[in-house]
Interface confidence: medium
């Protein structure tokens, strides 16, 4: 009888673990959807506001190819940085290539020197995978150096010509990115 009870208890515990896993997956999926939604809204907002503007990038933004970049002059934690960028119809910088990384680090050297700048990279709490804000994975050459020993959530930032990682709750400058307006001919 006792054995039967303990077997039932173990089965119930297993069920509970499975439900917790499902809930975690759902929460992650919901978070991902919310971010995707914000990302689309930012893109739409940018497209609409750009339509009323003749220059490819807004004032104080730097252009490189199809992108406009804004290097902040204030410090924020990572999440606030992302919110600040979204308010401007942009997202935190997503570095797609070594060429883009070189442009960013070269521009930063000219503008401000060797500070820390948040980019749109964060580490998934469960899998430990690095993800850009649109849900994509960075290319192998653009993974942050393992620098943070933080037990808290970890996010990516640029310093000098390196991509590094740090506790998302520390304050840093940040870089926003949005599409440059194509000039209509």
């Amino acid at each position: 009888k006792l054995l039967q009870v303990s077997t039932i208890a173990m089965q119930q515990q297993e069920k509970l673990i499975q439900q917790e896993r499902a809930l975690l997956n759902f929460t992650e999926w919901k978070r991902s959807c919310a971010l995707q939604m914000k990302y689309c809204q930012a893109f739409m907002q940018n497209s609409l506001s750009s339509a009323h503007n003749s220059s490819p990038c807004p004032n104080n933004w730097i252009q490189n190819r199809e992108s406009c970049y804004y290097v902040s002059e204030i410090w924020s934690i990572w999440h606030t940085s992302q919110e600040n960028c979204l308010k401007e119809g942009s997202t935190l910088l997503q570095i797609e290539s070594k060429e883009e990384m070189d442009f960013i680090t070269g521009s930063l050297r000219k503008i401000k020197g060797s500070y820390d700048y948040w980019v749109g990279l964060s580490q998934d709490g469960h899998s430990g995978r690095w993800l850009w804000q649109d849900g994509s994975s960075p290319s192998p050459g653009l993974l942050p150096a393992e620098r943070s020993q933080s037990a808290n959530q970890v996010c990516g930032y640029v310093k000098s010509n390196s991509l590094l990682s740090s506790n998302c709750s520390t304050w840093k400058y940040f870089i926003c990115e949005k599409y440059a307006l194509r000039s209509s001919v």
């Epitope: 902040s72 002059e73 204030i74 410090w75 924020s76 606030t80 600040n84 308010k87 401007e88």
Partner: nanobody, 117 residues
Framework: DVQLVESGGGSVQAGGSLRLSCAAS????????MAWSRQAPGKEREFVAR????????DYADSVKGRFTISRDNAKNTVYLQMNSLKPEDTAIYYC??????????WSQGTQVTVSS
Amino acid sequence: DVQLVESGGGSVQAGGSLRLSCAASGRTISNYDMAWSRQAPGKEREFVARISGSGDRTDYADSVKGRFTISRDNAKNTVYLQMNSLKPEDTAIYYCQIQDFRSPDFWSQGTQVTVSS
């Protein structure tokens, strides 16, 4: 128009204390994070401390951790920087700033702090 006026700077011996104040007028600062930074002669301006709008979150440069304390009184629209155990390397012009993404240029005029050994 927003104005940030500082007070409390001056000269002090190493190991001494100073309390800087930054009073804002023309805007309620309770919605904004506030920061202190400093610039020593011939060096870049560096981050010193920051406090969230509600005052529940603070952050410090490693060089001042444990010695400096940032605080705010939203009713008085003022931010403070309590500086203890001052060192000669703390000598700089100290600035406060409203951390407003859309208006990043709200810096104070700066107040001189000189620490002699």
